[in-house]
């Protein structure tokens, strides 16, 4: 199947030109999205061409912009954030990253009645989380890993923690390894519905061990980084969860909420809150064995001003056949009746579907079922459940929008984007409005993305948002590559594939194959995306093949395939793409004198040791910022999927699957080696081990390092990269530079 | 120097409603730094709380007492009041009026009343 | 209820020793832990609050210790007006308790 059909005609073949490597390092065709920044049931905000913040207002048509550019560039500001009272903006400058989410700023606050900046009692700076409460002006932010309370912008703060210290305690914001792990956030605190409420984490690093590394700047002496990251089977963080009055903070200061004892009783960690009614909330917890999780339902007590969790209130969810839920166990989305819920989880066949729970989880009335997969509910409303899913036409790399009418018996199905831009949009999210009244879908691919937006009662197009109609220009004289996404079945196993063809791909001919994998639990590579990057160019100028394969341990296709990896990480992952490739030699159009692999984190992982498989199929390969043993890598991420690195547990499949242990079958490959130095994320260690072993084993290979980078390489590092990548491939199959 | 005053009557029949105030003087009771709170002491035995109140009116009250118990606040006499209803023997106390600091936390009682004692009798 | 348990309940002690009171919360109530001296007829006079904050004007011979769920008040030389009773209160949360108290008597 054909996603991306050519538009190329003979007679035009001469005005067309084909991707440069520089196009893709300039972004040149780089695409945009249209996210309203939702403020009520039928008004958003959205950011300007010219940086102005306009209110629109979708059922009086009319809209106007309530802070100026003048005013952003008055402080530099790169983000705002309205107070729901509408009164107030908070402006954000001076963004600094940290890690993956998290990044400190200078917050400003602007007064919209009077047209000034606050001030007395100013924000300190840096601050590295500020948000809103949800109803009215209120001011959460964490400073100096201690959070303190605003009741009003101009007011003094109320200092709520005072045990925040650098590295060791941190209030409202995540450790390094809750942020990357388990929250997929910079906070850790929540608000409740009406803003009565503020709930937090507190993590206790004090016991956790510190990974360092040097960061070279330009001073005469490295700085170190010190991070406390807990490597597989190290000592974890401590969490606890508190709950403070925000009206009368004082007087009873912050509630602890208690650890259902199942979980307590041995290593856990605590995966979401969500708030379903002012007094009402609902934690999530996940024992260290990541098999079993347990949702607790807490009331607030009035009288002791504490927050009960009845037993009758734990639902738990366990797995047998690998780790409790996906990449993430699902958070629930509750129904108005503030009890019952609406969650993802695996039914009885092995495939993640939506399941409704009034009273236990063993009764839970299942919503949606068959042999795919419901992916996200975006929004539960009175009478409507809306949510993604790969089911139409049973392709699992995409994604379309659903609404299943709740209110009447038997529920009814509609998918709401299966039709409506079949070839272009085939990987859809949404973004909804208060009570879903209107909504705006996002089209990704695989045509050229647009973003609209739409009635959430009748779900007709309002109105097209986005739809890069400049890229769309800009790409009409461009030989894209052809782009089908087709399975191969091996063995009872169902190995789908994007493959990347020249824009004059001949059967006839041979072409050289490139594999890009990533291939990590609960990832899915082959998705109904548009892209023009790096492989695109790749096929357009170089003539490349290049494939993705999704093999066992991947997402969206039920359990057997998923937990297939649980426990022997870098074992059927490689075999699969190893399948895949002689599969694609045998459709006779692959040199089989030259192939490569190549990948980046874990896809580095998988590149290296399918190079080193000793089966002689791939000429070279390329690892990027790869892992080489699981005993380097996070606790949480590891331990999910391999259990813990003792004799009593897994040790000895973490000893048998690192990358070290196969450095005698790298003697004949080609094999570049690339790795930041300042990778918090997956350390440089996991490189310098891989290097050091080949060394050992007096195997040649090629290494390349960038300086003070991190897990992402970015900025002129990422031209160096791909220019450096590009050589090294066309090196290796052997095509003129 | 801050001084705080129980006054009320030293005798209350059983089923009837304790009423006490507490008058507070050398510094505002409307202080967003403070609650004012009751305690009591049978005699012989150790210290209960009974309940505090904020300037605004935000009460805060044993729940073993809370059925029975009003504490109410008016700034400008600078007093606060409380009143238990439905007392019984068990009720007879020395009562304290008292400040809370409870900023920076946590709070704590730093100025006490003299104390007044309520037998509960017929 | 967090329910404050002192220990011991009274003891006897000579001008000069060393005194200390132990106080068990039942269950963490951080360091919001706070200290009273009552006499006899007398209103309860505030000591140690936050676990170990010396309240201004009380001799530095008293001192406070501990976090969680175990607190100490310790007397460094006990003089003849520190003959009391001696009570612990927790204000992490409501409804706010107190121990049982202990009497510190003259040997």
């Known amino acids: 199947i054909v996603l991306r059909p050519s538009r190329v005609h003979n007679s035009e073949e001469n005005t067309m030109r084909a991707l440069t490597l520089k196009d893709i390092l300039n972004g040149t065709f780089s695409y945009k999205t249209f996210f309203p920044n939702w403020i009520s049931g039928q008004e958003y905000l959205h950011q300007s061409a010219d940086n102005n913040i306009v209110l629109y207002n979708i059922e009086t048509g009319q809209s106007y912009t309530i802070l100026s550019n003048r005013t952003m560039k008055s402080v530099n500001a790169s983000n705002y954030g309205l107070s729901p009272d509408r009164q107030f903006v908070y402006l954000e400058s001076d963004y600094s990253k940290l890690w993956r989410y998290s990044y400190t700023a200078t917050y400003y606050i602007y007064d919209l009645s009077n047209g000034e900046f606050v001030r007395g009692n100013e924000l300190p700076r840096p601050i590295q989380y500020l948000c809103w409460s949800p109803v009215g002006s209120k001011l959460a932010y964490v400073y100096q890993n201690n959070i303190y309370l605003k009741q009003r912008p101009g007011d003094p703060p109320f200092q709520i923690t005072f045990n925040g210290r650098e590295n060791k305690i941190f209030n409202g914001i995540p450790d390094w390894v809750y942020e990357e792990e388990m929250l997929a956030t910079k906070y850790a605190l929540w608000w409740s519905p009406n803003g009565k409420f503020l709930a937090y984490a507190e993590f206790n690093d004090t016991d956790i061990p510190v990974i360092a590394y040097s960061y070279y700047g330009d001073e005469q002496y490295p700085r170190t980084i010190n991070i406390p990251y807990p490597k597989a089977g190290a000592k974890n963080p401590v969490v606890r969860i508190f709950i403070i009055d925000t009206t009368y903070p004082a007087y009873v200061g912050p509630q602890e909420v208690p650890v259902p004892a199942m979980i307590a009783s041995s290593d856990y960690y605590f995966s979401w809150l969500t708030w379903v009614t002012d007094e009402r909330v609902c934690l999530q917890w996940l024992k260290r064995v990541q098999n079993v999780s347990v949702l607790s339902i807490c009331d607030f007590r009035e009288d002791w001003q504490t927050w009960d969790c009845p037993k009758t209130q734990e639902h738990i969810e366990e797995s047998r056949t690998g780790w409790a839920g996906g990449f993430f166990v699902s958070t629930p989305v509750f129904s108005y009746d503030a009890i019952s819920y609406y969650k993802i989880f695996s039914d009885k066949d092995g495939y993640k579907h939506i399941h409704y729970i009034k009273d236990t989880v063993e009764n839970a009335i299942q919503i949606t079922s068959g042999k795919w997969e419901a992916i996200n509910i975006f929004r539960v409303t009175q009478d409507s459940l809306f949510y993604s899913s790969n089911e139409f036409e049973e392709y699992p790399g995409r994604r379309n929008i659903y609404r299943i009418s709740i209110g009447s018996y038997p529920p009814s199905k509609k998918c709401v984007t299966c039709h409506l831009r079949k070839e272009r949009c085939q990987y859809y999210t949404a973004s909804f409005s208060d009570y879903a009244k209107y909504y705006a879908l996002v089209c990704y691919g695989p045509g050229i993305p647009i973003s609209t937006l739409h009635d959430g009662r009748t779900d007709q197009e309002i109105k097209i948002l986005e739809e890069n109609k400049e890229l769309e220009n800009a790409l009409k004289n461009i030989q894209l590559p052809k782009e089908e996404i087709k399975k191969l079945e091996v063995d009872e196993i169902t190995l789908w594939y994007k493959m990347i063809l020249p824009p004059q791909f001949d059967r006839s001919k041979k072409y050289p194959l490139l594999i890009q994998v990533y291939g990590g639990p609960c990832s899915q590579s082959v998705r109904s995306v548009f892209a023009v990057n790096w492989i695109s160019y790749l096929a357009s100028k170089e003539g490349m093949v290049i494939a993705l394969v999704d093999g066992r341990g991947t997402a969206f296709q039920g359990d057997k395939l998923l937990y297939a990896v649980y426990r022997k990480l870098g074992v059927y992952e490689v075999e699969d793409q190893i399948t895949a490739v002689r599969k694609f030699i045998e459709m006779g159009f692959i040199d089989e004198k030259r192939i490569a692999i190549w990948g980046w984190s874990y896809g580095g992982y998988v590149s290296s040791l399918a190079l080193a498989s000793g089966t002689g199929l791939f000429k070279c390969g390329i690892a990027v910022a790869p892992v080489s043993s699981w005993e380097y890598y996070a606790s949480v991420y590891t331990e999910r999927f391999m259990g813990l690195p003792t004799k009593d547990d897994n040790l000895e499949h973490y000893k048998n699957s690192t990358v070290m242990a196969r450095a005698e079958y790298f003697r004949n490959v080609d094999y570049l080696l690339i790795h930041g130095t300042a990778d918090d994320n997956v350390h440089f260690q996991n490189s310098a081990q891989i290097a050091k072993a080949l060394v050992n084993a007096q195997v040649d290979f090629q290494a390349m390092w960038y300086s003070d980078q991190n897990h992402g390489l970015s900025g002129l590092s990422t031209n160096h990269l791909y220019t450096h990548m590009t050589h090294f491939l066309k090196q290796c199959f052997s095509l003129s530079d | 120097q801050l001084q705080l005053q129980e006054s009320g009557p030293g005798l209350v029949k059983p089923s009837e409603t304790l009423s006490l105030t507490c008058t507070v003087s050398?510094?505002?009771?409307?202080?967003?730094?403070?609650?004012w709170g009751w305690i009591r002491q049978p005699p012989g035995k150790g210290l209960e709380w009974i309940g505090s109140?904020?300037?605004?009116?935000?009460?805060y009250y044993n729940p073993s007492l809370k059925s029975r118990v009003t504490i109410s606040v008016d700034t400008s006499k600078n007093h606060f009041s409380l009143k238990l209803s439905s007392v019984t023997a068990a009720d007879t106390a020395v009562y304290y009026c008292?400040?809370?600091?409870?900023?920076?936390?946590?709070?704590?009682?730093?100025?006490w009343g003299q104390g007044t004692l309520v037998t509960v009798s017929s | 209820d967090i329910q404050m348990t002192q220990s011991p309940s009274s003891l006897s002690a000579s001008v000069g020793d060393r005194v200390t009171i132990t106080c068990r919360a039942s269950?963490?109530?951080?360091?919001?832990l706070n200290w009273y001296q009552q006499k006899p007829g007398k209103a309860p006079k505030l000591l140690i609050y936050?676990?170990?904050s010396l309240q201004s004007g009380v001799p530095s011979r008293f001192s406070g210790s501990g976090s969680g769920t175990d607190f100490t008040l310790t007397i460094s030389s006990l003089q003849p007006e520190d003959f009391a009773t001696y009570y612990c209160?927790?204000?992490?949360?409501?409804?706010?308790?107190f121990g049982q108290g202990t009497k510190v008597e003259i040997k």
């Open positions: 008292a400040r809370e600091i409870i900023e920076p936390r946590p709070g704590y009682f730093d100025y």
């Open positions: 050398g510094g505002s009771i409307s202080s967003s730094t403070y609650y």
């Open positions: 109140i904020f300037y605004s009116g935000n009460t």
């Open positions: 269950q963490s109530i951080s360091k919001y």
């Open positions: 936050a676990a170990s």
């Open positions: 209160q927790q204000s992490n949360s409501i409804p706010r308790t």
